[in-house]
Interface confidence: medium
């Protein structure tokens, strides 16, 4: 039996490294985890503006610089449902990369780090 398409029940935005803090030249991986079937298209938003990238549940930021700093979220779109957006995650680029997460660096859900 074909499962009826349903809206995402929840979106988690996972970030590596933990806390979203990375040294210049490092790599950040953002993963949009969605519980929906069939899997919806996933787009990415930075500071309120969609990024001009092909839809993908994973956003890789290699060799990051300060221009990559900002607030990121992922948006799941499905033909039969409205978009659903994850809580935001803040990415910070620091010279040392050893600072703790900035206060309020992830959404209120507490998501934003890999379990």
């Amino acid at each position: 039996r074909v499962r009826e398409p349903g809206p995402p029940e929840g979106i988690q935005l996972l970030v590596e490294p933990e806390g979203g803090i990375v040294a210049p030249g490092g790599t950040v991986t953002l993963t949009c985890a969605i519980s929906a079937q069939p899997p919806p298209q996933v787009h990415w938003i930075k500071d309120g503006a969609p990024l001009p990238l092909a839809p993908s549940p994973v956003l890789l930021l290699p060799e990051v610089g300060h221009e990559d700093e900002g607030t990121y979220s992922c948006v799941a779109t499905h033909p039969s449902h409205g978009p659903q957006e994850s809580p935001p995650v803040s990415i910070r680029v620091t010279e040392t990369g050893d600072e703790g997460p900035a206060e309020g660096s992830v959404g209120e859900s507490g998501l934003g780090t890999l379990a």
Epitope: G48, S73, P83, E85, S86, P87, G107, E108
Partner: nanobody
Amino acid sequence: EVQLVESGGGLVQPGGSLRLSCAASGTIFSLNPMGWYRQAPGKQLELVALISDSGTANYADFVRGRFTISRDTTKKTLYLQMNSLEPEDTAVYYCRSTFAAGNFYWGQGTQVTVSS
């Protein structure tokens, strides 16, 4: 529970006009920046216009001078006045509450088709 409900879409000829509305409930509307986004078939989701909590409007280059975003805080409604519509404006238009209690909220979308 936050809800955003769009209306006002439809079929219009090139050069025509439409006014989209987005009614909000369950959120402190006057304190939330709001935006309109759109997605054409097979295309990327793209930002159309944003309006800040102070009422400052920002537009994508491809709609600047043709579209106007506004809000009525007493009615908790966001508007998008679309003039000089082009076939390339055909898309599903979504309104978005850009930040509310740590989460983002989207409407279900309204279809705009520009065709002769």
